[in-house]
């Protein structure tokens, strides 16, 4: 008799999830000499142990502690780039500006980027059919808890000037409910972080608005200043030119506003 299986509202575990995580781990440790000591099989075992046989709506940060320990990594704390709803451009930027790091440039972020996973209570199976949706099902699901955990640790590690890339095309440029707004903002350490500098990325070709005066940016500044962290903001009017100028800063057109 086929066993009844919980149907969740979100997509199921990414196909070939174990193989993907293991392959990504091997690739990352090959590219990053400082992480060559990492045993990728142990990393996968710790990752698996965080959610296998556990109810996918009852995952805690504690479940991920063995994985966090194995994935401990030191990135330059003054070279951190946070982002909210503009992942692709943030990643393009750190691919060019190699001394800056997004969460997905770290081992743990790289392993899980764009993947979905969940298990089932009391079985060792991975659920490839469906996984809990954060809104429709539950917030304490394996994926959400993972990103909350690594995002908190990443923000806690930041120091000096922290940059955040924000999507100026969205109705809420700063969204209190995003990972940045709900986790990272509140875990920047005022004794280490001097300034949060927001880069607001414009979407339109001809857009002369000053999105640093957007009400949600004012809200972000209010939250940040109450935590005794300075705030600054820059409009990136031309993201294409911005990336080009990061690649070729000596280009004569890069002295003007981007």
């Amino acid at each position: 008799v086929p066993r009844w299986r919980q149907q969740w509202s979100g997509p199921g575990t990414t196909k070939r999830f174990p193989e993907t995580v293991l392959a990504r781990c091997v690739k990352y440790t090959e590219i990053h000499p400082e992480m060559r000591h990492v045993d990728c099989q142990s990393v996968w075992d710790a990752f698996k142990g965080a959610f296998i046989s556990k109810h996918p709506c009852n995952i805690t940060e504690e479940d991920y502690q063995p994985l966090m320990k194995l994935g401990t990594q030191t990135v330059p704390c003054n070279k951190i780039l946070l982002w909210s709803r503009i992942k692709d451009l943030a990643h393009q930027f750190t691919q060019v500006q190699r001394d800056m790091f997004t969460l997905e440039d770290t081992l743990l972020g790289y392993l899980a980027d764009d993947l979905t996973w969940c298990g089932e209570f009391n079985t060792s199976k991975i659920n490839y059919q469906s996984c809990p949706d954060w809104r429709k099902d539950c917030s304490n699901n394996p994926v959400s808890v993972f990103w909350k955990t690594v995002s908190r640790r990443f923000a806690e590690a930041a120091c000096d000037v922290v940059h955040v890339m924000l999507n100026g095309s969205r109705s809420k440029i700063f969204d209190k409910n995003s990972t940045f707004g709900s986790v990272e903002v509140h875990n920047l350490q005022p004794e280490k972080v001097q300034t949060l500098e927001a880069w607001v990325i414009h979407g339109g070709r001809e857009d002369s608005r000053d999105l640093c005066q957007d009400p949600t940016i004012k809200e972000l500044e209010s939250i940040i200043s109450k935590r005794n962290i300075q705030f600054s903001c820059k409009n990136i009017y031309r993201p294409d030119k911005f990336l080009q100028c990061v690649k070729n800063p000596e280009d004569s057109s890069c002295t003007s506003e981007i």
């Epitope: 640093c212 005066q213 009400p215 004012k218 500044e221 200043s225």
Partner: antibody, heavy 120, light 110 residues
Framework: EVLLLESGGGLVQPGGSLRLSCAAS????????MSWVRQAPGKGLEWVST????????YYADSVKGRFTISRDNSKNTLYLQMNSLRAEDTAVYYC?????????????WGQGTTVTVSS | QSVLTQPPSASGTPGQRVTMSCSGN????????VYWYQQVPGTAPKLLIY???QRPSGVPDRFSGSKSGTSASLAISGLQSEDEADYYC???????????FGGGTKLTVL
């Protein structure tokens, strides 16, 4: 009641300095952007400067850039405008204004203004 | 010379509807929200319209704002004697990186 009260205006010689203050009450000063706007005798309104909540973002009109400095003390609920190298064309009533809640550039509360006269 | 262009004067009789314009360009009016302020002689300006067409609480619905392309308009219906004042439009100018005002329109209620 939301109130803004400017002070510090007066008669000053060209090249001189003056510091205007704006005392805020009736709202959480540290949650709002603030601005200075001036009005020369018989003329229209001219925006002077705007400062963000934590003073991390500041804007100036070209006509005052390099001469005027806007600042704020959130613990004292006070906005300031330090005016140096004053010129005759700076003669005006200076208003401080509070930015509208949940808005871009609107200023929803204004003080009654303080008069600055630059003359020899 | 103001960045935003307003007619210097307008007039109407009580009960009438008057409209005043504010003209700019792509970098100011088209791309940004427009604001209208009322200034009764000898008093501080008062916010009348924000975000193109929104009225703050306490402003009568006789006042309405609109915008099309690089122009904005303020309409006052059911004109009253207390509406006699100077009216200023304002916005952000993306090329100047500044908040800008129109020169103002003096409204006379005949």
């Amino acid at each position: 009641e939301v109130l803004l009260l400017e002070s510090g205006g007066g008669l000053v010689q060209p090249g001189g300095s003056l510091r205007l203050s704006c005392a805020a009450s009736g709202f959480t000063f540290s949650d709002y952007w603030m601005s200075w706007v001036r009005q020369a005798p018989g003329k229209g309104l001219e925006w002077v400067s705007t400062i963000s909540i934590s003073a991390g973002i500041i804007y100036y009109a070209d006509s005052v850039k390099g001469r005027f400095t806007i600042s704020r003390d959130n613990s004292k609920n006070t906005l300031y405008l330090q005016m140096n190298s004053l010129r005759a064309e700076d003669t005006a009533v200076y208003y401080c204004a509070k930015d509208n809640w949940n808005d871009y550039y609107g200023m929803d509360v204004w003080g009654q203004g303080t008069t600055v006269t630059v003359s020899s | 010379q103001s960045v935003l262009t307003q007619p210097p004067s307008a007039s109407g009789t009580p009960g009438q509807r008057v409209t005043m314009s504010c003209s700019g360009n792509n970098q100011n009016i088209r791309d940004n929200y427009v604001y209208w302020y009322q200034q009764v002689p000898g008093t501080a300006p008062k916010l009348l319209i924000y975000k193109d067409d929104q009225r703050p609480s306490g402003v009568p619905d006789r006042f309405s704002g609109s915008k099309s392309g690089t122009s904005a308009s303020l309409a006052i219906s059911g004109l009253q004697s207390e509406d006699e004042a100077d009216y200023y439009c304002a916005t952000w100018d993306g090329s100047l990186k500044a908040r800008v005002f129109g020169g103002g329109t003096k409204l006379t209620v005949l």
